[in-house]
C-alpha cells in the first residue's frame, strides 16, 4: 500500500479507539457540481431495462433517503415497443457507504456500513444452460 | 422531519463542532453477506451496452479504490451482434458518500464528500431523430 | 468544469497529413464520450468523429471515412484526430467536444456542453 506522510497538524487520537473511531465533518463538499443536471433524470424511461424508483428512508441512516431501482420487466424492450423475453432486464448494484448512528438515536455517534443498491437495470443476454 | 428521541448513553459533543463533527467507528457492519457474490460480476460483458472498469484510486479518500464503468460502444448491441447507432450506450451514475482525509494525510480525521460515479451502462433511445 | 485545448493545426498541403490532439483538465475525460467537429468560414459546425468513452468504439462522417480516426489516451487525459490524404474543402476550424447528455444519436450537436476554442487547419492545393 501507499504510506502516507503523517501531517503534524492532524487531531489527537487515544490508542484504545485509534484506528476505529475517527473524527468527521459532516459539512459535505460536493464534487459534482460540473456535471449536467440532466444526466440520467430520464434514462430510467427510455432505457430498453427501464426501471422504476423505489424511496427507502430511514432516519438512524445518514443519508437517511437512498432510491433503489426495480427492474419493470424480466425481458427487455424492444424496437417495436414489446417486451423480448429471450432478453433479461437485470439490475446494476452498488456496495456504497452509509453512516448509521451508534449507539441508536445518537445525533453525533455513528458507524460506517457497507450496503447493496440498484442503481438502475441493464439488458443481457440470458446465459442459456442446455439440458441433455 | 422526523424527531428522534436522544439517547442518554451518547457520546458527549461541544455545541461549537456540533453537529458537523462526528464521531465515527471505521469497523465496518457490512449489511450485505447474503448477496450473491457473482451478482452482476458479468453484466458489463453480457450487456446490450457493455462497459469496462477503471479503478480510480486515491489514498486521501476512503475507501481507496473506487471502480468506475466506461461504456465500450456509442450505440448498442444488437441481436447479430453489431452496434446498431441508431441507440444510445449511456453511464448509470450515482452519487456517493467517501470520507476525505482532512487536513491531508491525517489518518483519523476526515471530511464526508459526494462524489459521481458511473456504475454501469444501459442502453437508451434517443429522442432526437437524426436527419441525414 | 472541463477545460479543452486543442492543438495540432496547421498550414498542410493538399495530400499531407496532421494529428490534432485534444487535453483535457478538471473533470477526467473517461467519464464522457468525446467527439471532433469542425467549422468552416459561412458554414454551420458540423460532426466529424466520436469516440466512446472506453476508446473501444468510433464513429466518423461519411465524408472524411477512410481518411480521419479519432483515438484516446485516458491516462493522459488527450483525444486525437488523425487526419490524413487532406483535401483543401477540410479547411475549417477544428473542435472538440465532450458529450454530456443521449438525447440524440452520437452526431448529435446539442449532446455535447464542453467545447474548446478550436484549432485551424488549412490545406492548400
Known amino acids: 500500500g501507499i504510506t502516507i506522510p503523517r501531517n503534524p497538524g492532524c487531531p489527537n487520537s487515544e490508542d484504545k479507539n485509534f484506528p476505529r473511531t475517527v473524527m468527521v465533518n459532516l459539512n459535505i463538499h460536493n464534487r459534482n457540481t460540473n456535471t449536467n443536471p440532466k444526466r440520467s433524470s430520464d434514462y430510467y424511461n427510455r432505457s430498453t431495462s427501464p426501471w422504476n424508483l423505489h424511496r427507502n428512508e430511514d432516519p438512524e441512516r445518514y443519508p437517511s433517503v437512498i432510491w433503489e431501482a426495480k427492474c419493470r420487466h424480466l425481458g427487455c424492450i424492444n424496437a417495436d415497443g414489446n417486451v423480448d423475453y429471450h432478453m433479461n432486464s437485470v439490475p446494476i448494484q452498488q456496495e456504497i457507504l452509509v453512516l448509521r448512528r451508534e449507539p441508536p438515536h445518537c445525533p453525533n455517534s455513528f458507524r460506517l456500513e457497507k450496503i447493496l443498491v440498484s442503481v438502475g437495470c441493464t439488458c443481457v443476454t440470458p446465459i442459456v444452460h442446455h439440458v441433455a | 422531519g422526523i424527531t428522534i428521541p436522544r439517547n442518554p448513553g451518547c457520546p458527549n459533543s461541544e455545541d461549537k463542532n456540533f453537529p458537523r463533527t462526528v464521531m465515527v467507528n471505521l469497523n465496518i457492519h457490512n449489511r450485505n453477506t447474503n448477496t450473491n457474490p457473482k451478482r452482476s460480476s458479468d453484466y458489463y460483458n453480457r450487456s446490450t451496452s457493455p462497459w469496462n472498469l477503471h479503478r480510480n484510486e486515491d489514498p486521501e479518500r476512503y475507501p481507496s479504490v473506487i471502480w468506475e464503468a466506461k461504456c465500450r460502444h456509442l450505440g448498442c448491441i444488437n441481436a447479430d451482434g453489431n452496434v446498431d447507432y441508431h441507440m444510445n450506450s449511456v453511464p448509470i451514475q450515482q452519487e456517493i458518500l467517501v470520507l476525505r482525509r482532512e487536513p491531508p494525510h491525517c489518518p483519523n480525521s476526515f471530511r464526508l464528500e459526494k462524489i459521481l460515479v458511473s456504475v454501469g451502462c444501459t442502453c437508451v433511445t434517443p429522442i432526437v431523430h437524426h436527419v441525414a | 468544469e472541463v477545460q479543452l485545448v486543442e492543438s495540432g493545426g496547421g498550414l498542410v498541403q493538399a495530400g499531407g497529413s496532421l494529428r490534432l490532439s485534444c487535453a483535457a483538465s478538471?473533470?477526467?475525460?473517461?467519464?464522457?464520450?468525446m467527439g471532433w467537429f469542425r467549422q468552416a468560414p459561412g458554414k454551420e459546425r458540423e460532426f466529424v468523429a466520436a469516440?466512446?468513452?472506453?476508446?473501444?468504439?468510433?464513429a466518423v462522417a461519411t465524408f472524411v471515412k477512410g481518411r480521419f480516426t479519432i483515438s484516446r489516451d485516458n491516462a493522459r487525459n488527450t483525444v486525437y484526430l488523425h487526419m490524413s490524404s487532406l483535401k483543401p474543402e477540410d479547411t475549417a476550424v477544428y473542435h472538440c467536444?465532450?458529450?454530456?447528455?443521449?438525447?440524440?444519436?452520437?452526431?448529435?450537436?446539442?449532446?455535447?456542453?464542453?467545447w474548446g476554442q478550436g484549432t485551424q487547419v488549412t490545406v492548400s492545393s
Open positions: 478538471g473533470r477526467t475525460l473517461y467519464s464522457y464520450p
Open positions: 467536444a465532450a458529450r454530456t447528455s443521449y438525447s440524440g444519436r452520437y452526431d448529435y450537436i446539442d449532446d455535447y456542453s464542453y
Open positions: 469516440i466512446s468513452m472506453s476508446g473501444d468504439d468510433t
